[in-house]
Each structure stands twice: as C-alpha cells, then as structure tokens.
Interface confidence: low
C-alpha cells in the first residue's frame, strides 16, 4: 500500500524585533514531537513593518496599532487558524528603546503599553513586550547562530551540512550590529572573564559554556554616525561640515536639534551659533576612519585588555558570525566573500568612498538615497569597529563570516529569545534520537 503522510503536528512562534530603525516580525515553525532536539526550529516568514522603530512613536502612540497591523495580519495568514491560540507572540525591544528609557522611563513605558494593547487584540497567545538588555541581545544572538549551526548537538544532524562547517563542536562567536548598539559575544579560551557584568554561564544540551558578552550602547551604525557628526561639528567654524565619510559632492542639511535629540551625542553637546549645518561630502576613507577612531576611547583600561571605553574584552577566540547590519552593509558593498582579505576590503572601501555622489546615485538607482548615502560611513565604521574596537587583525579577519541566514533562518537574537522563552533548549542532552521531518505509515 502507498505510504501516506500523517497530518503535520507542528508548532509556531512569533517574535517581533523592535529595533531602533525598524521592527521585523519573525514566524518560526518546528515539529511538535521534537521540541527538545537541536536545529529543528526554522523560520518560515519575515515581515518588515513599514516605518521607523517604535521609539519614534513616542509623540504619536495612537498610530502604533496601525503600524503593526500589516505584519500581524500576515502572521494570521501564514499560521493555520487552528494554531492561532497556542502560538506565542513575544516582542523584544532593543537599543532604540533603551535610549528612550534613559531619557524618560515614563515615555518608554507608554510606548510599550500601547504596543502590548495592540498585540493583545490578535488571536495569538501574547506573552508580553519588553525592552531586552544588551546582555540578553548578545546572548540570544550567540544562541541563535550556534543552534542553527548545530554546535549544541553531539549527534549526527538530521539536516543538511550547514555552511561554515568546522567539523567540531567549538562554538562561533557572535558579532551583531544594529542601528543603536553593537554586541560581541564568544567563549574565550581558558580565560577568566575579569568583569562580572560581561560573564554568562549556560548549560545547554548537557554542556557548560562560559560566555563573554558586551553590548556597546550608542555604537550601532546610526548612533555612531550621530556621535561622529556631533563630535565634528564642535570644531567646524561655521555651519559647513566637510565630511570624509560621505561621497564627494554629497550635500545634506542637518538640524542641530535632531543632532542633540539622542542621549548618544550628549557628551559632545555644545551651544552652536546656528540651528542647521550642512554636510558636504569629500569621500576620503582614511580621513573617515581617523574621525571614527576618535569615538573609541582607548586610553583607559582597568583590565588586562579592553575593547574601548574601558570595557573588558578577552583575547578573540575561534570563528565569528557577523550578522544584522554587519552583513547587510558588507553584502551591499559586495564584501561578504570568505576570500576577501581585510586589506582587500580596505582597498575597496577607499575606492567606494571616493566615488562621486552623482555617480553612486546612477550606479545604485534603485536604492533609497538616505541609505545609499551612508554606506561609505557604515562600511568604514564596520572596519574601524572590528579592527580597532574589537582588535581583529588582517590574519584573524578570515575568522569573521558575514552571515545573513543559516538554513533559511535569519541570524539575530530573535530565534534564541524564543527558544529560551519556550524552554526549547534543555540543560541536559535529550535521550531520544532525532527522527526525520515527518513520520510515514
């Protein structure tokens, strides 16, 4: 008789990543009978919410409901109706909301309250909206990539061989770059983590992990740019800012009030004799790099070694997955290949930044000018952060893998967050052996 597949016994989960620049909704799916197996959860959908990050709705909270509608409706379509009530929904807000909370706890609470009320209107099992810590963001990103790479399992994986195969169970470090913060997380080699704030202990699938993590608030690519502008306008003698991080011929007017809106620029704030200034691009990688380095205070370190701003960083160890904006920016610049050396990346950045703005606009006609104009800065910032900030070298550069997706799931903190909240990563190794995707009779 012909084999017939039994109805799929699957479960779903939804996580909203409320980042500083935008919100994304992720839908995950896994076989119900294999919840505790490693690598069985996979992403089936990503929906990018149209509009800015939720922190920007502080003066118009009544619009949050409409803002979230499209993606929540998409989730309704993707997940079978019979599963709606048992599908958990989690919203995690990151550095954009951390910054808002620093300015005003009251305003941050107000935004989260409206988000929670909006999400409660859907037929899913809403589990709450909260601002996750930088430490959590780093940790969950690390869990995500190592879960997807199969690093937590001693067993033969049922899924196909993943990229970045290293034939061992040594975990990958995680490098995450957002708009408002950046995280570095990895297992150091036999190294005491000198700063307790940066130490995490996990027991996953029967193995102990001592993990280092740090989140640098204000050092995401967007906030780093605001910092750089605030620093540089201090020494400009009037309202013209010659900026090496923008293409030659690029021009943009910036409101001083916007510049000083974020807590990230407070240290550079001063009374300026103008309300607006004009950025004029001069497109010089070397000068841009120099300017960015001034954001990293490397003169003070109370530990055996530091990243910057007095933050402990152990010696780098093993391979690293660099994701989120690390990946998006380098992908745009066509620099994600494992074969591209650090020297080559620098060379390409020099050429890219020097290209006239008019030429760039023509070459990338389909890209929004707001994003297009910032790739020179972002690419240079990534190099500066990885090389001078985290102390990667030309040699260790080959250990950085720019990762967008692994096995169809986005690299990022959301999957790790859901795995943790749904208790799908057991402390001990499950006894059962993994089965194939579905059972046939």
């Amino acid at each position: 008789t012909q084999n017939k597949a039994l109805p799929e016994n699957v479960k779903y989960g939804i996580v909203l990543d409320a980042g500083s620049s935008h919100t994304s909704l992720y839908i995950y799916k896994w076989p119900a009978e294999k919840e505790n197996d490693t690598g069985v959860v996979h992403q089936v959908e990503e929906c990018r919410v149209k509009g800015p990050g939720i922190s920007k709705f502080v003066q118009k909270v009544n619009e949050i409901g409409i803002y979230l509608t499209d993606c929540m409706e998409r989730a309704r379509e993707v997940i079978p109706r019979s599963q709606h009530q048992e599908t958990p929904v989690y919203l995690g807000a990151t550095a954009g909301m951390r910054l808002l909370r620093m300015e005003s706890e009251e305003l941050a609470d107000r935004v989260l309250d409206v988000v929670e009320r909006s999400l409660s209107n859907y037929p899913f099992d809403f589990q709450g909206a909260r601002i996750i810590t930088g430490q959590e963001e780093g940790a969950y990103g690390w869990i995500t990539i190592n879960y997807l790479l199969g690093k937590f399992s001693q067993k033969t994986r049922w899924f196909s061989i993943v990229p970045y195969e290293t034939n061992n169970q040594e975990t990958f470090g995680a490098l995450d770059l957002g708009g408002a913060s950046t995280q570095v997380t990895f297992v150091p080699q036999n190294q005491t983590i000198e700063s307790p704030d940066n130490a995490l202990q996990f027991r996953l699938y029967g193995k102990d992990y001592n993990v280092y993590t740090h989140s640098f608030l204000c050092y995401g690519k967007d906030q780093a740019l605001w910092q750089k502008l605030a620093k540089d306008i201090q020494v400009a003698s009037n309202e013209i800012l010659r900026d090496p991080c923008f293409h030659p011929g690029y021009k943009k007017v910036v409101n001083v009030s916007d510049l000083y809106k974020t807590p990230c620029t407070k240290r550079f704030e001063m009374t300026l004799p103008f309300q607006q200034f004009e950025i004029q691009g001069i497109g010089n990688y070397q000068q841009c790099h120099q300017s960015i380095l001034e954001l990293f205070n490397t003169s003070y370190c109370p530990y055996s070694q530091c990243a910057f701003n007095g933050i402990f960083l152990p010696p780098l160890q093993g391979d690293f997955g660099a994701f989120s904006a690390f990946y998006f920016v380098m992908k745009f610049l066509n620099l994600t290949s494992e074969k591209v050396s650090q020297e080559k990346v620098t060379e390409m950045m020099k050429k890219f930044c020097a290209q006239p703005w008019e030429e760039i606009k023509t070459s990338y006609a389909g890209v929004k000018e707001k994003y297009l104009s910032e790739y020179c800065f972002s690419g240079t910032y990534i190099l500066s952060l990885l090389l001078q900030g985290y102390h990667f070298t030309a040699d260790s550069w080959e250990h950085i893998h720019f990762i967008g997706k692994i096995q169809g799931s986005d690299a990022g903190w959301t999957l790790g967050y859901m795995l943790n909240l749904t208790n799908m990563i057991p402390a001990e190794q499950p006894l059962s052996t993994p089965l194939s995707h579905s059972t046939y009779v």
Partner: antibody, heavy 119, light 109 residues
Framework: EVQLVQSGAEVKKPGATVKISCKVS????????MHWVQQAPGKGLEWMGR????????KYAEKFKNRVTITADTSTNTVYMELSSLRSEDTAVYYC????????????WGQGVMVTVSS | DIVMTQSPDLAVSLGERATINCRTQ??????????MNWYQQKPGQPPKLLIY???SLASGVPDRFSGSGSGTDFTLTISSLQAEDVAVYYC????????FGGGTKVEIK
Amino acid sequence: EVQLVQSGAEVKKPGATVKISCKVSGDSITAYFMHWVQQAPGKGLEWMGRIDPDHERTKYAEKFKNRVTITADTSTNTVYMELSSLRSEDTAVYYCATERVPGFETDYWGQGVMVTVSS
Amino acid sequence: DIVMTQSPDLAVSLGERATINCRTQQTVDHYGTTYMNWYQQKPGQPPKLLIYLASSLASGVPDRFSGSGSGTDFTLTISSLQAEDVAVYYCQQSRNLWTFGGGTKVEIK
C-alpha cells in the same frame, strides 16, 4: 567643456535693484554650488553668497545678507543674483563661479558683469 | 567668517623667486585636507585657479608655481618670475563657504 556666460553690463540709479544672470552650458548646475563674487574697481575679491541649485539652499556673506538674493532655474540651467537698494559703492564687476566638491579643482568662472551705480 | 591676511605688494626681478604669504585667523584644515586655494588675476579677466588644496597644481598651470602650508599659514611661490606672471594673487579658503585674502600685486623690479 563647462562655460559660464553672464548677462550684459548694467547702469543703475542708487536705490534701484539689479538682477544679473549666469547661464551654464556643458553640465547641469545641480552638480555644483554656484557662487557670486564682487570686485569693486581697483579692489579685491569679495564673496557674496552661493546657491545649491539641487536643493535651492542659499548662503550669504554677512555684509550682503539683507540685500542679495540668489536664485536658480534648473530648467534653463541659469543662476541669478539680485542686489537691491543699490548704492555707489556697489559699482563693481560681479562674477559667477562654480564649485563642485568644495575645495577641489572643478572651478569655472563667468566673464564678469560690470554694474555701475550712479545718479 | 574666516579672516585672511595677505603679505603686501612686491616687486621681483625677472627670473627671481617670488613668495606671497597668507595667514588665516583660524585653521582651514579638516581631517588632513587643507582648504586653501590660490588665484591669479590679470586686469579685465576673471580670477584663474593656480593651486587648490594648499599644494595641488591646477591643470595647465606651469610648475614654477607651488603652494605650501597648513593650518593657518600658507605660501605661494613662483620659483622664477616671468613677465606674464605680473598680476594680483589672491588666497582663498573654502573650508567654510568662501573668503578671499586682500590680494598681493606682483610687479617686475
């Protein structure tokens, strides 16, 4: 080859307004900042102001701020400088000039327009 | 505005070196780029760019012209004065909008 051709000489009475044009050929004015420079007889060069035709943004020197208006017409690739409340000390040659990336060598000047203010 | 002061007029013999100085009230450097230009102007003509970014020779300009300096002190040098170099020379900063120096007249002694 980029060329800047300015309008003809003008004679004006004190208190009047003069409007000078500068037509650019060989490239779009939106690729440049367009500057105006004054030079009184036997005197040095004095920067008056500039326009970014791409965004219609202007900047003026403090000395001329209340009397000068620089405009641009991208459809005809022409920039204009209007100076009001003319006085005898405004008698000068007025030059238009281009600047692409500030400080770099993409520098073209018009031939200049002589404006005489006399009662 | 950035105020600029140029050295007084000078008379130099043909074939001799001519040096013109320009001082700015505040720096015209920005991240390693120096926004100082030098122009030559002859009677009845618009200014002609000689030197840009303090020391780069504009195209078509003879190499007897050179520029040097950074920060607030700058020099234009004509290594061997020729008859056709008789003109007024202006320094100009373009770090913050434009400002010109007062001009230096170069004549033959």
